[in-house]
């Protein structure tokens, strides 16, 4: 699992756009019944903010125990606090559930900084503001943890929505969403609208604020504007995609596109930042610095450490560039681009200076594990995880933060050749060499 502002602990050869336009994809292709339309009961079912993660209310056990659960597309375990912890207001009490079944098996998940461990079992699970179903799902009851739960975050567990391949202790532990789809008629798809505040929130405001929507089993048209553009899921483990080109204010970074996906590129709601491989990060920061050179910022700001403050309402958004990621399209030699604003990659931080200030952290950081499109990216877009068709869709979010001059965008098609070459093939370990 990732780290470095990777929640919960961690608080990641494009051709130029040509005149030739390919036929654009429309939303008018046949869909399964119930796939599209309105999902009123699920809209606004997420709370939180990008710095501490977005959570959904879930119930576990019989009688139902209500818990807030972090929505994490970068992992695959459903794991909940099951013992007292200083940062938890409540936890799962297995002994009070008549439907709990012990799997008599432990699970240990270490991170770069911190870990959690627990005991595996199954129980009945439902999502009050989700589909009207109850499923028996695997649950890791967290009995011990270090630097996992976040003080004041208001969530008590994590819902890993990625694929079984990265489940712990191994891929035989069926993830929650797989169980949901198998046991019910819910289509194999979910979509996320994460709504960044755009301004600092104090604790009471966070608890009262709406953080976005997780639409389980479908797509809600009210949550986005324009068209949805889809990129293939390269491999079903993380939600892995392929980036084919990166631009800062329209200027191509001009790197071998393999660098953008070294060693992978994933879409991860459990990571705060846009995380980039070292070489890409350095090139991107150099370009962002050049674009915003009328003002200089301390070195620690670009490392995501120091905060920069402006008098309330005077943040000079216009001096910071837009960032565009071109993603492989569904059609051969076709890509599309998603463009984020500084309103997405400068993360508001509250309560550090005076009330007369707006303070921000730079939310793009360096990664040794590939590109991670975290909340910084996702807060600009409505993101559809179409597992059934092995693709991820992006459209401009109806709730993204912008100003009167610029808006986030999803645009295409663009002609891009040899996109398959942009994917990095992680060397497989020859297990036989380990048998010594």
């Amino acid at each position: 699992t990732q780290h470095g502002i990777r929640l919960p602990l961690r608080s990641g050869l494009g051709g130029a756009p040509l005149g030739l336009r390919l036929p654009r994809e429309t939303d008018e292709e046949p869909e399964e019944p119930g796939r599209r339309g309105s999902f009123v009961e699920m809209v606004d079912n997420l709370r939180g903010k990008s710095g501490q993660g977005y959570y959904v209310e879930m119930t576990v056990g019989s009688p139902p125990q209500t818990l807030n659960i972090l929505v994490d597309t970068g992992s695959s375990n459903f794991a909940v606090g099951a013992a007292p912890h200083p940062f938890l207001h409540r936890y799962y009490q297995r002994q009070l559930s008549s439907t709990y079944r012990d799997l008599r098996k432990g699970v240990y998940v270490p991170y770069t900084q911190g870990k959690w461990e627990g005991e595996l079992g199954t129980d009945l699970v439902s999502i009050p503001h989700g589909p009207n179903v109850t499923v028996r799902a695997n649950i890791a009851a967290i009995t011990e943890s270090d630097k996992f739960f976040i003080n004041g975050s208001n969530w008590e567990g994590i819902l890993g929505l990625a694929y079984a391949e990265i489940a712990r202790p191994d891929d035989s532990l069926e993830p929650f969403f797989d169980s949901l789809v198998k046991q019910t008629h819910v289509p194999n798809l979910f979509s996320l609208q994460l709504c960044g505040a755009g301004f600092p929130l104090n604790q009471s405001e966070v608890l009262a604020s709406v953080g976005g929507s997780m639409i389980i089993g479908g797509i809600d048209h009210s949550l986005y504007t324009g068209s949805l553009w889809y990129t293939p899921i390269r491999r079903e483990w993380y939600y892995e995609v392929i980036i084919v080109r990166v631009e800062i204010n329209g200027q191509d970074l001009k790197m071998d596109c393999k660098e953008y996906n070294y060693d992978k590129s994933i879409v991860d709601s459990g990571t705060t930042n846009l995380r980039l491989p070292k070489k890409v990060f350095e090139a991107a920061v150099k370009s962002i610095k050049a674009a915003s050179s009328t003002e200089k910022f301390p070195d620690g700001f670009w490392l995501g450490e120091q905060l920069v403050c402006w008098q309330a309402g005077t943040t000079p958004w216009n001096i910071f560039p837009v960032i565009s990621l071109y993603l492989m399209g569904e059609v051969t030699n076709q890509s599309f681009r998603i463009t984020i604003l500084p309103q997405q990659y400068l993360r508001p931080v509250e309560d550090v200076a005076t009330s007369q200030d707006d303070c921000y952290k730079f939310a793009i950081s360096q990664s040794s594990t590939g590109t991670v499109m975290g909340a910084v990216i996702m807060e600009g877009f409505y993101v559809v995880f179409d597992r059934a068709r092995k693709r991820i869709g992006f459209a401009v979010s109806a709730c993204h933060v912008h100003d009167e001059f610029r808006t986030a965008a999803v645009e295409g098609p663009f002609v891009t050749l040899d996109m398959e070459d942009c994917g990095y093939n992680i060397p497989q370990t020859d297990e036989s060499t380990l048998m010594t």
Partner: antibody, heavy 120, light 108 residues
Framework: QLQLQESGPGLVKPSETLSLTCTVS??????????WGWIRQPPGKGLEWIGN???????YYNPSLKSRVTISVDTSKNQFSLKLSSVTAADTAVYYC????????????WGRGTLVTVSS | EIVLTQSPATLSLSPGERATLSCRAS??????LAWFQQKPGQAPRLLIY???NRATGIPARFSGSGSGTDFTLTISSLEPEDFAVYYC??????????FGGGTKVEIK
């Protein structure tokens, strides 16, 4: 060796505008490596940051003083200046100009300071 | 707003003794903290930056430590010229604005 020197009147009347200039010698104010700033210290008290300026003219001010402060730069004269309007006796202080180095984070070089007294 | 509290307000020591000055931040400032020395009638002088790095020309007897909210300036063996007022400043929030109230190191 780079040096900073404050200059300006030592006495200002209440409600008037305090004006000080800092002259940079032994180096260029147009260096992209530094911001330039003003800090003050009332007699017998601690340090108070007033504001910073970059050679391009980009400024940052202390929110508590912002409505009264203007900092400007004149690269041709290798100088930057402070204006503080509507002064009162509470503005009596030693005023220092300083260089903000080490990745634009630390005041690593200071002028000797000049005492400005606000009195009628 | 981040508040820096220095203690003690006054430290009375003799030359050759070890001085330990404390600076506590009201919330974490990571390692973005500086220490300054100010002698009577003079401008402050940067001693330590990034909590533990000595500035150019600062003697080795001065050392800084700490991160987060608790920081210490240590003068291993006081020289006569070290008797002065010492200020800490956080630069975690930029532009750097917050200074501590100061600790006076005086001759006992």
């Amino acid at each position: 060796q780079l040096q900073l020197q404050e200059s300006g009147p030592g006495l200002v009347k209440p409600s008037e505008t305090l004006s000080l200039t800092c002259t940079v010698s032994g180096g260029s104010i147009s260096s992209s490596s530094y911001y330039w700033g003003w800090i003050r210290q009332p007699p017998g008290k601690g340090l108070e940051w007033i504001g910073n300026i970059y050679y391009s003219g980009s400024t940052y001010y202390n929110p508590s003083l912002k409505s009264r402060v203007t900092i400007s730069v004149d690269t041709s004269k290798n100088q930057f200046s402070l204006k503080l309007s509507s002064v009162t006796a509470a503005d009596t202080a030693v005023y220092y100009c300083a260089r903000l180095g080490h990745g634009y984070s630390y005041f690593d070089l200071w002028g000797r300071g000049t005492l400005v007294t606000v009195s009628s | 707003e981040i508040v820096l509290t220095q203690s003690p307000a006054t430290l009375s020591l003799s030359p050759g003794e070890r001085a330990t000055l404390s600076c506590r931040a009201s919330q974490s400032v990571s390692s973005y903290l500086a220490w300054f020395q100010q002698k009577p009638g003079q401008a402050p002088r940067l001693l330590i930056y990034d909590a533990s790095n000595r500035a150019t020309g600062i003697p080795a007897r001065f050392s800084g430590s700490g991160s987060g909210t608790d920081f210490t300036l240590t003068i291993s063996s006081l020289e006569p010229e070290d008797f002065a007022v010492y200020y800490c400043q956080q630069v975690y929030v930029w532009p750097p604005r917050t200074f501590g109230g100061g600790t006076k190191v005086e001759i006992k």
